[in-house]
Interface confidence: low
């Protein structure tokens, strides 16, 4: 067993003093642990010497010497106090991590043994400890919180009474980690896998546990696979990783893969599906109808679902006309990935303008080729109405043109008095035109219809109104004759009231 000179077990010195610690053994000896740069270390025959010419409070700690060749593994220790009147504490670690129910050592070392009677442990800023905090103090080691609880994970300070006042150490953060009382934690990557026959694939099953006593295996359908296991320890947990690497996949590799881990507390498993396909695929679909009708000024989101393997090499939204050569703004196109092989692409069309009706196509490309999905967008418009007086085949005729989408229907009203719009109470006659003549009906455009009202004589104290309506709204135009009795009248002899 090695011997330390001076004999100790404790040595008290003042700051600035020279300290020499000599360890002597039968064979070679060495000092344990990292020696701070304040010390000079040298060998003197069978002994090892630690020396400092300027002791500081930071030299306060236990110094241990061992004899590696000693079969009994004996060691000797001396505890050095450097009693600094301004620095009662030497804190060896600012952060301590333990599991619940372990003892937590907060390594604040007292620099002067005389102060031991007046020490206490407090939370940061002098807060008292949480109730039921069971702790003890060792001047050599610091404060020990026994069977630490998760809630005791706090910032602590060591307090010493010096000359009637309490002097605090710098703070020590205690982290108490919860022990997970269950089976090991598992990950199986990827969550889903698709490969073309002949490609390479990799499936990784990993499990972690608080202690090393646990098992993990990877299973294909019902077969347990024999795969070498890689073990590791980090983040205070034991890790076991199984990696299945397939150089060239075939159809027999497809199926369900399960990662299973167990410990004394039970079993945990997670699964994924591996699909092997003959060739690349690219499928486009939409839950929406490909023929869309929206009222002008409103907004629309066009959504396309894409299932593809391998991944997309390109995609875009294109406006195919017929109104202009404008293209959708990229900022209005959004892509979200549901999972590795399924994506959703959305084109937002806010406040639709007349020139934005038409065909919108989503194109996507992967090694399997190009695919497109085209939406037809027709805008709905409320009817716009105009009435003119004209002569057709020598008969005076009111001609009403109504334009909108869907196709408007037309009703004529005759009512008493001069008015902008016929009131129900004033109506004298109503004519419904069951088949107004369609003047124009182009794709993605308004439908224009025309209705004629032949009137031999227009009463001067009456109003003739053409009304048109469709599912979006209605429009009307009131016509008021200026003079009475005329069989035909040129337009300038009449007042037009829109």
């Amino acid at each position: 067993i090695p011997v330390i000179e001076p004999s100790g077990p404790e040595l008290v010195v003042k700051p600035g003093e020279t300290v020499t610690l000599r360890c002597v053994g039968n064979g070679s000896v060495e000092w344990d642990g990292p020696i701070s740069p304040h010390w000079t270390l040298y060998s003197d025959g069978p002994s090892s010497v630690l020396t400092t010419n300027n002791a500081t409070f930071q030299n306060t700690r236990t110094y241990r010497c061992t004899e590696p060749g000693d079969p009994l593994g004996g060691s000797a220790a001396i505890h050095l106090y450097v009693k600094d009147p301004a620095r009662p504490w030497n804190v060896l670690a600012k952060e301590v991590v333990v599991f619940e129910d372990q003892d937590a050592l907060l390594p604040c070392l007292l620099t002067d043994p005389v102060l031991e009677a007046g020490v206490s442990l407090v939370r940061l800023r002098g807060r008292p400890l949480l109730r039921h905090t069971n702790y003890s103090f060792s001047p050599w080691h610091g404060f020990i919180i026994h069977r630490a609880k998760f809630i005791q994970g706090q910032d602590y300070q060591c307090s010493a009474l010096m000359g009637g006042r309490k002097v605090m150490s710098i703070s020590i953060r205690l982290k108490v980690q919860k022990v997970i009382p269950g089976p090991p934690a598992l990950t199986l990557v990827p969550a889903e896998l698709v490969r073309i026959r002949g490609e390479a694939a990799q499936i990784v099953c990993s499990a972690s546990n608080i202690d090393v006593d646990f098992d993990v295996f990877l299973q294909h359908n019902t077969t347990k696979l024999a795969i070498p296991q890689r073990s590791d320890f980090h983040d205070n947990r034991y890790q076991k990783v199984l990696t299945l690497s397939l150089g060239q996949v075939d159809f027999q590799h497809a199926g369900n893969y399960s990662c299973v881990a167990s410990n004394v507390q039970g079993k945990h498993s997670t699964s994924m599906f591996f699909q092997v396909v003959e060739s690349a695929y690219l499928d486009l679909s939409s839950e929406q109808n490909l023929i869309q009708e929206v009222t002008v000024g409103e907004g629309l989101n066009l959504k396309v679902m894409v299932e593809a393997y391998p991944g997309l090499q390109g995609f875009n939204w294109t406006y195919l006309g017929p109104f202009s050569d404008h293209q959708p703004e990229p900022k209005l196109a959004n892509a979200t990935t549901k999972d590795t092989y399924r994506h959703t692409f959305t084109l937002s069309l806010p406040r639709l303008k007349p020139s934005e009706a038409g065909r919108y196509s989503f194109l996507a490309r992967n090694p399997g080729g190009w695919r497109a999905l085209t939406f037809e967008l027709t805008l709905r418009y409320p009817p716009e109405v105009s009435v003119i007086w004209t002569s057709i085949n020598g008969s005076g005729t009111l001609l009403c043109a109504a334009s909108g989408y869907p196709q408007p229907n037309v009703t004529w009203l005759q009512c008493a008095g001069h008015t902008d719009r016929c009131d129900e109470a004033q109506v004298l006659q109503v004519w419904v035109d069951p088949h107004p003549e369609v003047l124009s009906q182009e794709p993605f455009q308004k439908v224009t219809v025309q209705s004629l009202l032949t009137a031999e004589t227009l009463e001067h104290n009456q109003t003739y109104e053409c009304r048109a309506h469709n599912s979006v709204g209605s429009g009307s135009w009131a016509f008021i004759p200026i003079s009475a009795g005329a069989r035909t009248h040129p337009p300038d002899e009449f007042l037009f009231t829109p």
């Epitope: 800023r125 807060r127 307090s159």
Partner: antibody, heavy 126, light 107 residues
């Protein structure tokens, strides 16, 4: 004798910055363990803690206002300051500063707001 | 945030009576609670800290008790100068939070 007194603009408009000063005597913010906090009380409502500053310049803020609040100190002039940016009418209140003084307790010093200023009324109005 | 629910919001009592005011925390605050008295036009005055410790200079008729989430302030033998609003403050966790206050009137 410990005294604290708040001063501020009285009235200010929405979106302006409120600057408050707490001038104190009878203690020093350089003393180990000492702190100053700010609290406010809208008329007819309860008290709301805003921020603390400690002797070592450690600062704590109410998360509901954190990105609008700044607390600071000038130890040589025995002053603490609070800035509240982009004020709303709902920031109208009486604002108090208070000392967080060391209280002797059998196991350790323990701290609360032990002395308060008289408060300063702040009105935010357009 | 820890919510502090104080009750009652107001109470009326006669000289010489004993009254109790409660503060309920939304989670355990480990005795980190203070009680204050506030009179109109005056600043708050610390009565009790650490749930039950009496601040220097505060009359002994004031006392605090409780643990965990439930705390109370008791005033024995009410005197006319005790008419005020009383409130609690938790500083167990940031943000520090106050109770809503209890207005004590004397009949």
């Amino acid at each position: 004798q410990v005294t604290l007194k708040e001063s501020g603009p009285g009235i200010l408009q929405p979106s302006q910055t409120l600057s408050l000063t707490c001038t104190f005597s009878g203690f020093s913010l350089t003393t180990y363990g000492m702190g100053v906090g700010w609290i406010r009380q809208p008329s007819g409502k309860g008290l709301e803690w805003l921020a603390n500053i400690w002797w070592d310049d450690d600062k704590y803020y109410n998360p509901s206002l954190k990105n609008r609040l700044t607390i600071s100190k000038d130890t040589s002039n025995n002053q603490a300051f609070l800035k509240l940016t982009n004020v709303h009418t709902s920031d109208s209140a009486t604002y108090y500063c208070a000392r967080i003084g060391p209280i002797k307790y059998p196991t350790a010093p323990y701290r609360y707001f032990d002395f308060w200023g008289p408060g300063t009324m702040v009105t935010v109005s357009s | 945030d820890i919510q502090m629910t104080q009750s009652p919001a107001s109470l009326s009592a006669s000289l010489g009576e004993t009254v109790s005011i409660e503060c309920l925390a939304s989670e355990d605050i480990y005795d980190n609670l203070a009680w204050y008295q506030k009179k109109p036009g005056k600043s708050p005055h610390l009565l009790i800290y650490y749930a039950s410790s009496l601040q220097d200079g505060v009359p002994s008729r004031f006392s605090g008790s409780g643990s965990g989430t439930q705390y109370s302030l008791k005033i024995n033998s009410l005197e006319s100068e005790d008419a005020a609003t009383y409130f609690c403050l938790q500083d167990s966790e940031y943000p520090w939070t106050f109770g809503g206050g209890t207005k004590l009137e004397l009949k």
